[in-house]
Amino acid sequence: LKGQEFAPSHQQVYAPLRADGDKPRAHLTVVRQTPTQHFKNQFPALHWEHELGLAFTKNRMNYTNKFLLIPESGDYFIYSQVTFRGMTSECSEIRQAGRPNKPDSITVVITKVTDSYPEPTQLLMGTKSVCEVGSNWFQPIYLGAMFSLQEGDKLMVNVSDISLVDYTKEDKTFFGAFLL
Amino acid sequence: LKGQEFAPSHQQVYAPLRADGDKPRAHLTVVRQTPTQHFKNQFPALHWEHELGLAFTKNRMNYTNKFLLIPESGDYFIYSQVTFRGMTSECSEIRQAGRPNKPDSITVVITKVTDSYPEPTQLLMGTKSVCEVGSNWFQPIYLGAMFSLQEGDKLMVNVSDISLVDYTKEDKTFFGAFLL
Amino acid sequence: LKGQEFAPSHQQVYAPLRADGDKPRAHLTVVRQTPTQHFKNQFPALHWEHELGLAFTKNRMNYTNKFLLIPESGDYFIYSQVTFRGMTSECSEIRQAGRPNKPDSITVVITKVTDSYPEPTQLLMGTKSVCEVGSNWFQPIYLGAMFSLQEGDKLMVNVSDISLVDYTKEDKTFFGAFLL
């Protein structure tokens, strides 16, 4: 019996069939962040809830120390949403006063770390200028895409300013990945 | 013949192989909303087109009365975009007049209802303050993530203000889910 | 041996089993755009990197001349993010001066072209008014959803103003699709 028995004629003979319920998957949810040391010139990484509420890891996808560990090579869909909230930037007043005005911004980066490679790889970035005219503001940045990952790769979510992250609800700020 | 015949050595023997084309899937598109009564203190749920144009449901994933019905337990990727549009709020003027200013906001929630559980579960929330200075404004909120659902669970999309939803085009406001 | 041997009892007998690693997939990343002619009343299409850095196409999913070519009928998840950046719109000043004020906007459309069908189909649209009060602004629009596509369909990403697209980093602006 060959591996391509029930597959379309273009399927590679050597491609293994695979039960979907057995694939590495994780959905992590926000927790209150504690101030930690991080590398200069690198955005701080968020840490996550991995088993309570809506959060889970399964099928050898593990979470440890801010990282999702990729247990098996393949193509993964990776996603995250970070909800930010803050006080109004004074950029509109600064502008009216005629001084140069660099807008504040909020940024989310999903980063891949490969031990054999010296530099982290930025997989996804969402970045937005913030120059609100109301009092308090809040808004999400959502990211999601497919990447080819190797067993042993590690994924993390970095943000421009950890103090602006809304950690109050598990449905507002989250991070996930699943093998396709 | 064992279930893991063509699978990597780490596959569980009992995990069933499954044809992808047979999995429950739905993509729903916006329709014009009509003013209705709904539970007080709960955001109103949108209703959807499920068979015309780009919309479809398949493989026992059914749509009824604002809900997507989950026909089979498993991990689902769930997504929605809602495009909002409205007229400029007077929030900037209020601020200039020195009065306290709580900004208006737009919010989308993807909610799970389980009959055996008294309270709905908020799976995903996108929320954004709105304090625009132009005349009319418009913007989307996108959400998507993976969740473990049970057969019989129901999914809906709730919004903070149904009057602001742009119902004019099927590509602007939509809701979908598929079994992984 | 029947096709449903290891599948749940509700599986269609005729549904072929399929190795996941064999499915058509692509993740394309931004490149600097060159000014080109495009049809009047149609937003210009972006062109993309398909093999360097994070970009790839595999399993007969090909990229050519701004289009992703769909090699096989089925349900695909399609996504894109476009990061825009620009100078401040003058809409706030226009409003204060009491002149008519149409807000500027940024729009992303994922479009399907079917050779046998005269008109392109807009699958997904993200559109946002831009009326910023700071100096320079930047922000992403993210889209993603599932669609039933036919072999031979072509996908492209159109934007309202190609000159506002941030082409500087592969993680900021991207386009992808994969067979479910």
Epitope: - | P35, K40, C91, I162, S163, Y167 | N101, K102
Partner: antibody, heavy 117, light 106 residues
Framework: EVHLLESGGGLVQPGGSLRLSCAAS????????MSWVRQAPGKGLEWVSG????????YYADSVKGRFTISRDNSKNTLYLQMNSLRAENTAVYYC??????????WGQGTMVTVSS | DIQMIQSPSSLSASVGDSVTITCRAS??????LNWYQQKPGKAPKFLIY???SLQSGVPSRFSGSGSGTDFTLTISSLQPEDFATYYC????????FGQGTRLEIK
């Protein structure tokens, strides 16, 4: 059934004030934006003012800005329009309407406001 | 503000006729145009949204078309109850109505 009922119209002298009310029933009032639209005798329709479902955002036509104030009490399912410094040109039938993404789905029957000395 | 100009201001037609009313915007309003019908002494009734989509319960003899600056409302086979005044309304930038078109029995 969705129903809107305006009240508070009447005769008022130029420079005077009037407060219109619109009682809503049959739908979850707090989830819908509302507007006031007026129609002068023998003339066309003119949008006057709007308010978001939560009441945090208000919108006005230039012709009434600074003189009219729209508000709502979601606990009473009631919309209001406070009209000050009234002028003869404000004479009209005032309708309240449910606004859905810039269109007016459902209208009340209207209340007549006459500004005259 | 965006001006909406309807034409004609009035027209006469007979039962069974087909009539077209035009609405022109002073600048592009995409497809954000709505149509209403009003009978004497009554509140307006919502007919068409997004330039061409029929509100539920509205007879299919009513149709709308157009985008950008030029729009039309067509009534394909006039019925006695269709004689009324018709208004267009844009919601692209703030809200403005056309001046109305009065449709009378010939």
């Amino acid at each position: 059934e969705v129903h809107l009922l305006e009240s508070g119209g009447g005769l008022v002298q130029p420079g005077g004030s009037l407060r219109l009310s619109c009682a809503a029933s049959g739908f979850t009032f707090s989830s819908y934006a509302m507007s006031w639209v007026r129609q002068a005798p023998g003339k066309g329709l003119e949008w006057v003012s709007g308010i978001s479902g939560g009441g945090g955002s208000t919108y006005y036509a230039d012709s009434v800005k600074g003189r009219f104030t729209i508000s709502r009490d979601n606990s009473k399912n009631t919309l209001y329009l406070q009209m000050n410094s009234l002028r003869a040109e404000n004479t009209a039938v005032y309708y309240c309407a449910i606004e859905m993404a810039g269109a007016f789905d459902i209208w009340g029957q209207g209340t007549m406001v006459t500004v005259s000395s | 503000d965006i001006q909406m100009i309807q034409s004609p201001s009035s027209l006469s037609a007979s039962v069974g006729d087909s009539v077209t009313i035009t609405c022109r915007a002073s600048q592009s309003i995409s497809y954000y145009l709505n149509w209403y019908q009003q009978k004497p002494g009554k509140a307006p009734k919502f007919l068409i949204y997004a330039a061409s989509s029929l509100q539920s319960g509205v007879p299919s003899r009513f149709s709308g078309s157009g985008s950008g600056t030029d729009f039309t409302l067509t009534i394909s086979s006039l019925q006695p109850e269709d004689f009324a005044t018709y208004y267009c309304q844009q919601s692209y930038s703030s809200i403005t109505f056309g001046q109305g078109t009065r449709l009378e029995i010939k």
